[in-house]
């Protein structure tokens, strides 16, 4: 009987699905911001127009998704990149190939309890294209145990190569499982 | 007391996980069927053989997954494409590269409340292959707020380049979070 | 009142989200193990260091994630591959291209009730790179109905091409929906 009666009062521990923190953010035009060489640039996001939303205390602020409740979250992002012929595709250099250009996406966690940002997910791809204009997505998604107050951001190797034209091509989201 | 008694009728608001609408559809051989010019072709799917299933009022009909209950859904698809050497890979043309071939997947939402189909997710990739036979997947997945009656489909740029041979290579699914 | 009392007894059927089996495994250095030619090699994983964890009776043993409870699971993996120039990218051979090298990931289910392993998910990509060092991920994720005791593993076409340097580049996970 005790168990039966105490279950409902424990309900807050088991947040119903409809009340779970969740967000789907979509790309917006980036303002070029100087950042340190060899440091990945953080993207900023649309959080309430079109397909974008934040719900149930999941908050977006200053490039970060802020986790409102400890638990296991599924986090995902797709970044579509686009560019012109990469240097390593120069046919005159094929016999002496150089280090290829590359595109990289990192989903990073910043925690107050830990000074160093943690790389949760990385997608990285060499790009060696001989066509005039190339384009391709990198998709990432996985589950992580997060703490209340943890902040998530998406970093890319070259902000100028990100396709920010459409919300369905470049996006970032998370939900409590 | 009123609230307690009305809860069961409101049960759809907090659907238990096991009762949540969900589907995993797998590829089946397409019959070449003409569709409007410049319009992406919609794929049709297996919904109850092998790994494929629909559950809890999630319904598959005529290329569409039909959403039975409003809520936030995780939607995903992988399409494996394959083909032969693409023209832009022709080594004699490298100095004057042409527009590359490309492969595109779009997960589209059709809503009775809105006349225009909405692109939820797009994966698009230039293809410039100098090898004999090329093959590669495009994966998409994200969360969207959907309404009862919304219909989801998967469209591709070229139906003749899709790998239809195996259910584990080309698939489409959704579940209420 | 009736509802409050009956809910807990139904609780086992609808496992609360916090009690659901789940795991996120990360790559570790592989010991080269001989396996049959043309047979995919199974990866082994880190299950409790860094970002890796198993929870709520989800168990990792001997390259397998063991499913503790029947239900619908979302299963995902990313494998980052890396290598040097693939043979078909040899510029002198462009006019007579050979079969391209390829990279393949398969998430496989082994069930006691069925002797043959089942391929749940396959990601396969031709690799024909003219750059000196190439690298790229294959991502997979989908939902499957699994039975208690089912075992999941990740197989790859060439274990020597897997990037095992970072837990955020190569990983494998599953959670009960």
């Amino acid at each position: 009987v005790t168990e039966e009666r105490s279950a409902p009062s424990a309900q807050p521990v088991y947040t119903p699905s409809r009340d779970k923190p969740k967000a789907h953010l979509t790309i917006m035009r980036q303002t070029p911001v100087p950042h340190l060489k060899n440091e990945l640039a953080a993207l900023h996001w649309e959080n309430n127009l079109g397909m974008a939303f934040t719900k149930n205390r999941m908050n977006y602020t200053n490039k970060f998704l802020v986790i409102p409740e400890s638990g296991d979250y599924f986090i995902y992002s797709q970044i579509t990149f686009r560019g012109t012929t990469s240097e390593c595709g120069d046919i005159s250099r094929v016999r002496r190939p150089k280090k290829p250009d590359s595109i990289t996406v990192v989903i990073t966690k910043v925690a107050d309890s830990y000074p160093e940002p943690a790389h949760l997910l990385t997608g990285t791809k060499s790009v060696c294209e001989i066509s005039s204009n190339w384009f391709q997505p990198i998709y990432l998604g996985a589950m992580f145990s997060l703490e209340e107050g943890d902040r998530l951001m998406v970093n890319v190797s070259d902000i100028s190569l990100v396709d920010y034209t459409k919300e369905d091509k470049t996006f970032f989201g998370a939900f409590l499982i | 007391v009123t609230e307690e008694r009305s809860a069961p009728s409101a049960q759809p608001v907090y659907t238990p996980s096991r009762d949540k609408p969900k589907a995993h559809l797998t590829i089946m051989r397409q019959t070449p069927v003409p569709h409007l010019k410049n319009e992406l072709a919609a794929l049709h799917w297996e919904n109850n053989l092998g790994m494929a299933f629909t559950k809890n009022r999630m319904n598959y009909t005529n290329k569409f997954l039909v959403i039975p209950e409003s809520g936030d859904y995780f939607i995903y698809s992988q399409i494996t494409f394959r083909g032969t050497t693409s023209e832009c890979g022709d080594i004699s043309r490298v100095r004057r590269p042409k527009k590359p071939d490309s492969i595109t997947v779009v997960i589209t939402k059709v809503a009775d409340s809105y006349p225009e189909p909405a692109h939820l997710l797009t994966g698009t990739k230039s293809v410039c292959e100098i090898s004999s036979n090329w093959f590669q997947p495009i994966y998409l997945g994200a969360m969207f707020s959907l309404e009862e009656g919304d219909r989801l489909m998967v469209n591709v740029s070229d139906i003749s380049l899709v790998d239809y041979t195996k259910e584990d290579k080309t698939f489409f699914g959704a579940f209420l979070i | 009142v009736t509802e409050e009392r009956s809910a807990p007894s139904a609780q086992p059927v609808y496992t609360p989200s916090r009690d659901k089996p789940k795991a996120h495994l990360t790559i570790m250095r592989q010991t080269p193990v001989p396996h049959l030619k043309n047979e995919l090699a199974a990866l082994h994983w880190e299950n409790n260091l860094g970002m890796a964890f198993t929870k709520n009776r989800m168990n990792y043993t001997n390259k397998f994630l063991v499913i503790p409870e029947s239900g619908d699971y979302f299963i995902y993996s990313q494998i980052t591959f890396r290598g040097t120039t693939s043979e078909c990218g040899d510029i002198s051979r462009v006019r007579r291209p050979k079969k391209p090298d390829s990279i393949t990931v398969v998430i496989t289910k082994v069930a006691d009730s069925y002797p043959e392993p089942a391929h749940l998910l396959t990601g396969t990509k031709s690799v024909c790179e003219i750059s000196s060092n190439w690298f790229q991920p294959i991502y997979l994720g989908a939902m499957f109905s699994l039975e208690e005791g089912d075992r999941l593993m990740v197989n790859v076409s060439d274990i020597s091409l897997v990037d095992y340097t970072k837990e955020d580049k190569t990983f494998f996970g599953a959670f009960l929906i």
Partner: antibody, heavy 117, light 108 residues
Framework: QVQLQQWGAGLLKPSETLSLTCAVS????????WTWIRQPPGKGLEWIGE???????NYNPSLKSRVTISVDTSMSQFSLKMTSVTAADSAVYYC???????????WGQGTLVTVSS | EIELTQSPGTLSLSPGEGATLSCRAS???????LAWYQQKPGQAPRLLIY???RRATGIPDRFSGSGSGTDFTLTISRLEPGDFAVYFC?????????FGGGTKVEIK
């Protein structure tokens, strides 16, 4: 190198059943659809039907009622049966690999089937 | 079903010359899903072109395809001795798949 080797009876009487088999070597069997096509002497080609490694079939509607295509994945073989043949079914029958889709990049050597009383 | 008509029936040319073969469909071929094959006497057909203009693996670049809608063309820029054969077109934009009657390219 992919090779398709086919065999079966070449001479049939009207109303009999045509039976041909095609064995695939030198490549993956499960990654493709496999097709039968025929060519009457001096004429064009006609698509008969196709099968996947898992046994999924599609047939030309004009022949569907008389045709069965089957597969033996363990042997990397697929077969064609056509019932109630007539002289109009006399042709060279080819097996072929479908790649990328609905076009045929590797072919068997062909089997001449003659239907005559 | 879509009927494909090839013309001319026979084309008499010399090695080194260019050849233009026509394939006309009874209705529009969806997405230019048209292929070309070469067949030599006693041999199986060989895939040359698919998607109206995509060359199949190992096909030399003197073979090119073009066209859309109902009218398609196979062009051989410089005929070599091994190119004298029968050429068939095939549409796969509508079910069932259908083939043309063929054009014979012979040595003049």
């Amino acid at each position: 190198q992919v090779q398709l080797q086919q065999w079966g009876a070449g001479l049939l009487k009207p109303s009999e059943t045509l039976s041909l088999t095609c064995a695939v070597s030198g490549g993956s069997f499960s990654d493709y659809f496999w097709t039968w096509i025929r060519q009457p002497p001096g004429k064009g080609l006609e698509w008969i039907g196709e099968i996947s490694h898992s046994g999924r079939t599609n047939y030309n509607p004009s022949l569907k009622s008389r045709v069965t295509i089957s597969v033996d994945t363990s042997m990397s073989q697929f077969s064609l049966k056509m019932t109630s043949v007539t002289a109009a079914d006399s042709a060279v029958y080819y097996c072929a690999r479908d790649y990328p889709n609905w076009v045929f990049d590797y072919w068997g050597q062909g089997t001449l089937v003659t239907v005559s009383s | 079903e879509i009927e494909l008509t090839q013309s001319p029936g026979t084309l008499s040319l010399s090695p080194g010359e260019g050849a233009t073969l026509s394939c006309r469909a009874s209705q529009s071929v969806f997405n230019s899903y048209l292929a070309w094959y070469q067949q030599k006497p006693g041999q199986a057909p060989r895939l040359l072109i698919y998607g109206a203009s995509r060359r199949a693996t190992g096909i030399p670049d003197r073979f090119s395809g073009s066209g859309s809608g109902t009218d398609f063309t196979l062009t051989i820029s410089r005929l070599e001795p091994g190119d004298f054969a029968v050429y068939f077109c095939q549409q796969y934009g509508n079910s069932p798949l259908t083939f043309g009657g063929g054009t014979k390219v012979e040595i003049k």
